[in-house]
């Protein structure tokens, strides 16, 4: 399986909400002894391996933000803890999973990573991640709504 990031760059005005998205692609083993663990964390550029550095998102670790279930079941994080920090991660039955960040500030700018761990009990963990950048802007040059740039090209889309 692979993880796709529909958008590689999100440019948002301060105070706006944004939903960062990843998609699980390819055949997914739904066997009894296969589980998928999905989560989000911040990272930084300039590493040998993108997303190898794991930093909290608004003081919440990847463990705090994880989604747990088997196969393509829907799931979401512990609401209380995440929502107190203006965060919510969720997934659907089609392999899409996301993190929503509310009331963005300039401090939210940076590289974000989604991580999928395919747990094959008795064998190993298989990790796949996706990366995307969030730029939060303020002032007259800031867009009125979030603008997203698809991973395949630099054509932008406006989202409200």
């Amino acid at each position: 399986f692979k993880v796709a990031t529909p958008y590689s760059l999100y440019v948002c005005p301060e105070g706006q909400n944004v939903t960062l998205t990843c998609r699980l692609l390819g055949p997914v083993d739904k066997g009894h002894d296969v589980t998928f663990y999905k989560t989000w964390y911040r990272s930084s550029r300039g590493e040998v391996q993108t997303c190898s550095e794991a930093r909290p998102i608004r003081n919440l670790t990847a463990a705090d933000l994880h989604l747990h279930h088997g196969g393509h079941q829907a799931a979401n994080t512990s609401h209380d803890l995440a929502q107190r920090h203006g965060l919510e991660s969720a997934s659907d039955h089609h392999g899409n999973f996301s993190i929503t960040m509310r009331n963005l500030t300039l401090l939210d700018s940076g590289l974000y990573c989604c991580l999928v761990v395919e747990i094959r009990h008795h064998h190993s963990e298989h990790r796949v991640h996706g990366a995307m950048e969030l730029q939060v802007q303020t002032g007259k040059d800031a867009p009125s709504n979030c603008v997203v740039y698809p991973s395949s090209s630099q054509d932008s889309e406006n989202i409200t």
Partner: antibody
Framework: QVQLQESGPGLVKPSETLSLTCTVS????????WSWIRQPPGKGLEWIGY???????NYNPSLKSRVTISVDTSKSQFSLKLSSVTAADTAVYYC???????????WGQGTMVIVSS | EIVLTQSPATLSLSPGERATLSCRAS??????LAWYQQKPGQAPRLLIY???NRATGIPARFSGSGSGTDFTLTISSLEPEDFAVYYC?????????FGGGTKVEIK
């Protein structure tokens, strides 16, 4: 804040079954791996096995024939059973939370189990 | 199973000195390696995961590096509370295994 607490008899006779329980408080047991690790006196750490919240288990091959780990989500507890014990099984037994693709981030304080007649 | 060999077995240093601990794997573990600290009578405490990511609440004087088969835990300036036994642990596959430990003692 998640906390783990081991409980069970501190003395087990040779050939009998060692039984320990770990109680998870301050958080949900319905996620992560829940592991048992042991440490013989003056020695290093040995991973015994885990139970995933879904019920899937995975054991160290060196102990697999003697180990059973189970979970009771309604009580927020998981348990270890180690059969046919010998003096070599004397150790401090720890329960721990293991985060997928991460590490053992929360440990119980450990409980000493002595195998002796 | 993957064997982790830690060296030295004992490291005798003074407070304020730099400690460099080594962990070598019998085969590549990528960067899937953790470090723990254990003090007498206590459970191990997670310091570093994925070779260099500091766990929550761990002071910046602890840092990890390496990938493949060779890893290093560095304590930049030893504090009195840092004298303990340190273990490495791999998680690239099961069974999860630990190194034999390095004891950092006061010189």
């Amino acid at each position: 804040q998640v906390q783990l607490q081991e409980s069970g008899p501190g003395l087990v006779k040779p050939s009998e079954t060692l039984s320990l329980t770990c109680t998870v408080s301050g958080g949900s047991i319905s996620s992560y791996y829940w592991s048992w690790i042991r440490q013989p006196p003056g020695k290093g750490l040995e991973w015994i096995g885990y139970i995933y919240y879904s019920g899937s288990t995975n054991y160290n091959p060196s102990l697999k024939s003697r180990v059973t780990i189970s979970v009771d989500t309604s009580k927020s507890q998981f348990s270890l059973k180690l059969s046919s014990v010998t003096a070599a099984d004397t150790a401090v037994y720890y329960c721990a939370r293991d985060i997928p693709a991460s590490a053992f981030d929360i440990w119980g304080q450990g409980t000493m189990v002595i195998v002796s007649s | 199973e993957i064997v982790l060999t830690q060296s030295p077995a004992t490291l005798s240093l003074s407070p304020g000195e730099r400690a460099t601990l080594s962990c070598r794997a019998s085969q590549s573990v990528s960067y899937y390696l953790a470090w723990y600290q254990q003090k007498p009578g206590q459970a191990p405490r997670l310091l570093i995961y994925d070779a260099f990511n500091r766990a929550t609440g761990i002071p910046a004087r602890f840092s990890g590096s390496g990938s493949g088969t060779d890893f290093t835990l560095t304590i930049s300036s030893l504090e009195p509370e840092d004298f303990a036994v340190y273990y490495c642990q791999q998680r690239i596959n099961w069974p999860l295994t630990f190194g034999g430990g390095t004891k950092v003692e006061i010189k």
